[in-house]
Interface confidence: low
């Protein structure tokens, strides 16, 4: 029988009446156009909704937008369009919401063609009030907040000027011209690339990378011959042109660009690209595109300096620059990532790693599923997950995989069971242990979301017909109840819940269509009365993450430590609550060779944990570039994996000697840098 339909599924008592009392409809006095929704702050209940409607006239496009505000998680909305003087807001810039709980919002208005500059509306009180400000430039990008100080904003103008405000957009100053890309770093630092000759496109590969640490009073050129740059964790990366035949290399800095090292990664040609897939303060996952239009490349994982890289995964699916990759960080369990590979026969297969890219394996076949037509052997196959690539290919996949840091171990995704991803209609699968084991959760494609830190999962069937039914589960997707939230079905457009999965409210968005008109409508359902009591100690059970062999003393050890979590029992129907904090007990493991990556000049033969010297390098000096100097490496082949906390056990030693020689290949050496002041 289908999941949730067997007799042992206990029904939540009187849920229809409880939910009916907590279902709030809001019909928006709008013609249907587009709608965008933003949460302002964390746990504030404030939602802003911007509806936009374009009327194409013969000569020009007339636009109209309305702004609505809720302060009760979407149960009620108030039209606050008058606060922005009924101005048409440009949806391509979205609503720029300030970091943390600053309460700041910036909306960018549409202005008439001949105006000197753009116009913004600013609020610093969670959109209760707005101030109109005329800009001395036309913005090209959305206003970007400094992560450290929400009063500091930067924006690029349509004329490629870099503009900065120190008083939350009240006053603006152009600090540099001819700017292609600008990003905030840490400590209110701004990094940006500039062009010297024609344009950003014409100078690609000849750009300069600049830094200002004082909002434009002084500058330092920290790189030349730049193609692009990126920030990830504590790493600053620059893609640097290597020579006249248009290859480029990645350089990395961990001191905001003062010193650079050439990353030990392959160079790429004109048609190839690098992509930072994920980064934290310990390490980075880097994708390096294959030459030719292959649609795949190689994933490399870095050491703690971002310099030495280990090959992590071959034939990694990544279509083109800025294209599609299925790479997904499973945030509900440390060290877990899921992605897709393009196999030799051009089929797409899902791979998972539980140890931050050390080893990749296929996903275990769900026990309650059969292998599909793609499987050669009907008894042996794997689960394959649909993610960004499937969505881009217009497969019947409404949502990417979902996990939440505070819903420990839970991963929800569309998938198919066979030898490769199938183009057939997918089902929804759930894992409650971070991806080690999977169960079919729902037949057919659905939208889904996690509420109350995993206490409730909500789903809506993906259908082209109007819908009026929502499904919910209080036991991590084992059993499902259905609730009819309206008599009049709506054309469903999206599920919205507060980011962070702590809320117990879900908003169902859609539109109604009558003979003459269509209107936006939202239904907000509060599940607080379904989970009527607060969870107590007895509702939680101890769970050892990454456990695969309970008999083994080292069971659960990943990256040098194991973690025991307190997890809600599936049978407990109670509220984790908004203040729920994941309780975990870490314990350090003994070091083994698995806790070390292979150092520069070494590699791991397949199915072997030992790092062996590349045969042709035996007896030769190992030299590599570090901070623009040549280093001599004395090593026995191992370097501790970034973030690995193991102690004792195996302890290979390594030593690096400074050869005090310049690396002529390091295009970002200090002597090529200069400073200047405004």
């Amino acid at each position: 029988s289908a999941p949730g339909e067997d007799e042992e599924c206990g029904r939540v008592r009187d849920f229809v009446a409880k939910l009916a009392n907590n279902t709030h409809q809001h019909v928006f006095d709008d013609l249907r156009g587009s709608v965008s929704l933003s949460w302002v702050g964390d746990s504030t209940g404030v939602i802003l909704v911007l509806t936009t409607f374009h009327v194409p006239l013969v000569i020009m496009t007339f636009g109209q937008s309305k702004l609505y505000r809720s302060e009760d998680y979407g149960k009620n909305f108030k039209d606050i369009t008058d606060l922005i003087n009924n101005t048409f807001i440009r949806t391509e810039f979205g609503m720029a919401i300030g970091p943390e709980n600053s309460g700041k919002v910036v909306l960018t208005a549409e202005v008439s063609g001949g105006s000197r500059g753009g116009r913004i509306f600013r609020s610093s009180d969670f959109a209760k009030n707005f101030v109109q400000t005329d800009l001395p430039f036309h913005p090209l990008t959305q206003m970007m907040y400094s992560p450290q100080n929400s009063d500091y904003l930067l924006a690029l103008s349509t004329e490629n000027g870099l503009w900065v405000s120190k008083n939350f957009g009240g006053k603006w100053e152009e600090i540099h011209k001819a700017v292609c890309l600008a990003k905030w770093g840490s400590d209110n630092t701004i990094f940006f690339t500039t062009y010297a000759n024609g344009s950003c496109k014409a100078d690609l590969g000849a750009l300069e990378l600049w830094r200002t640490s004082d909002l434009g009073k002084s500058f330092k050129t920290i790189g030349v011959k730049i193609y692009s740059f990126g920030l990830g964790g504590r790493f600053l990366f620059a893609s640097v042109m290597a020579d006249k035949d248009t290859t480029r290399r990645i350089h990395v800095s961990t001191d905001q660009g003062d010193t650079w090292s050439m990353a030990q990664l392959p160079s790429v040609g004109q048609e190839q690209f690098y992509s930072i897939l994920a980064a934290n303060d310990d390490m980075v996952f880097m994708h390096v595109d294959e030459p030719g239009d292959t649609g795949f490349g190689t994933i490399f994982t870095s050491d703690d300096r971002g310099i030495v890289y280990s090959k992590s995964l071959d034939r990694h699916l990544y279509t083109t620059t800025g294209g599609e990759t299925d790479f997904t960080n499973v945030t509900s369990l440390r060290g877990v990532y899921i992605t897709s590979v393009l196999s030799e026969d051009n089929s797409i297969q899902t791979m998972i790693t539980f140890d931050q890219g050390g080893r990749w394996t296929h996903l275990r076949k769900p026990e309650n599923s059969e292998c599909d037509a793609t499987a050669k052997n009907k008894n042996e196959c794997s689960l394959h997950i649909h993610a960004s690539y499937s969505i881009s290919q217009k497969l019947n996949v409404p949502m990417a995989p979902l996990s939440e840091p505070n819903a420990v171990g839970i991963v929800i995704a569309h998938g198919s069971v066979g030898d490769a991803i199938s183009v057939m209609v997918p089902d929804v699968y759930i894992s409650d242990d971070g991806g080690y084991s999977w169960t079919k959760m729902l037949e057919g494609p659905h939208y889904y979301t996690i509420l109350d830190s995993g206490g409730i999962i909500v789903a809506i069937e993906h259908s082209s017909r109007p819908i009026n039914v929502i499904k919910f589960s209080t036991d991590e997707g084992q059993c499902w109840q259905t609730y009819t939230f309206t008599r009049d079905p709506i054309y469903f457009t999206g599920l919205a819940s507060e980011p962070g999965a702590r809320s117990m409210n879900i908003s169902i968005w859609g539109f109604t269509e009558s003979f003459l008109t269509s209107q936006w409508v939202s239904y907000t359902i509060d599940f607080k009365d379904i989970l009527e009591r607060n969870c107590e100690e007895k509702d939680y059970t101890i769970w050892l993450a990454h456990s695969t062999d309970p008999e083994d003393y080292e069971d659960g050890c990943i990256l040098g430590y194991k973690e025991q979590f307190l997890r809600l029992r599936k049978s407990s129907v109670c509220q984790n609550g908004r203040d729920y904090v994941v309780t975990k007990q870490p314990s350090i493991c003994l070091c083994s060779l698995e806790d070390f990556l292979c150092d520069f000049g070494y590699y791991r033969p397949e199915n072997d944990s030992k790092c062996v010297e590349q045969p042709e390098l035996k007896g030769h000096d190992l030299e590599f570039c570090l901070y623009g100097r040549e280093e001599h490496l004395t090593t026995n082949g191992y370097r501790k994996i970034p973030g690995d906390k193991c102690q004792g056990g195996v302890n290979p030693v390594r030593e690096v000697k400074d050869l005090k020689k310049k690396c002529t290949s390091n295009f970002l050496s200090p002597e090529k840098q200069n400073s200047k002041s405004n």
């Epitope: 035949d245 392959p266 390096v288 294959e290 030459p291 090959k311 190992l622 030299e623 002529t664």
Partner: antibody
Framework: QVQLVQSGAEVKKPGASVKVSCKAS????????MSWVRQAPGQGLEWMGI????????SYAQKFQGRVTMTRDTSTSTVYMELSSLRSEDTAVYYC??????????????????????WGQGTTVTVSS | EIVMTQSPATLSVSPGERATLSCRAS??????LAWYQQKPGQAPRLLIY???TRATGIPARFSGSGSGTEFTLTISSLQSEDFAVYYC?????????FGGGTKVEIK
């Protein structure tokens, strides 16, 4: 344009040494490795070794270990291949070739191989008593 | 070391015909394989890299395929300038090794 220009033909006696140069132009010398390949008369191609112009680190085929030395001069964008203890079977055309191999080449390659895309014109070395 | 074996040693083909050259590796070289063309008295010229990607300026009649241990170079319609010796070369594990070559001659 990208070019590798090699030194002229050499005639050597058995037991002597020969040093062949290869001057690179048209690209950033330090951005690519350089391989040396030889071809005996009427025979196929034989890879001898590779040098990283950055640090000068080298990797040689086992067959030539102890007899071959590859060096580079970054100021003149030139690589050198010296073969000692010459024997008659070392009579061959010696080529330098730009090689975009992996980081610590040639180990397990970390991507599809680009191939040796630019070759010198070849230097004929004749070993005869 | 990885041994590369090319077959046939000689291939006699008429102009305009299709030529198929094989290269086998003694162990998997993944896609780390290149094909070269060499004419008498000239240096080799790169045709194909990454097993299947044509190098810059190489006509579309040349195509490479294969992965792992079996590789093929196909010349769809031989032109007079295509009669030469063709070598495959692996770069999966050092030392780099070449196949013995296939001579394509006029029939």
């Amino acid at each position: 344009q990208v070019q590798l220009v090699q030194s002229g033909a050499e005639v050597k006696k058995p037991g002597a040494s020969v040093k062949v140069s290869c001057k690179a132009s048209g690209y950033t010398f330090t951005s690519r490795y350089m391989s040396w390949v030889r071809q005996a008369p009427g025979q196929g191609l034989e890879w001898m070794g590779i040098i990283n112009p950055v640090g000068g680190s080298t990797s040689y085929a086992q067959k030539f270990q102890g007899r071959v030395t590859m060096t580079r001069d970054t100021s003149t964008s030139t690589v050198y291949m010296e073969l000692s203890s010459l024997r008659s079977e070392d009579t061959a055309v010696y080529y330098c070739a730009r090689d975009p191999s992996g980081i610590a080449a040639p180990g397990p390659a970390s991507r599809g191989y680009y191939g040796m895309d630019v070759w010198g014109q070849g230097t004929t070395v004749t070993v005869s008593s | 070391e990885i041994v590369m074996t090319q077959s046939p040693a000689t291939l006699s083909v008429s102009p305009g015909e299709r030529a198929t050259l094989s290269c086998r590796a003694s162990q998997s070289v993944s896609s780390n394989l290149a094909w070269y063309q060499q004419k008498p008295g000239q240096a080799p010229r790169l045709l194909i890299y990454g097993a299947s990607t044509r190098a810059t300026g190489i006509p579309a009649r040349f195509s490479g395929s294969g992965s792992g241990t079996e590789f093929t170079l196909t010349i769809s319609s031989l032109q007079s300038e295509d009669f030469a010796v063709y070598y495959c070369q692996q770069a999966r594990l050092g030392p780099w090794t070449f196949g013995g070559g296939t001579k394509v001659e006029i029939k």
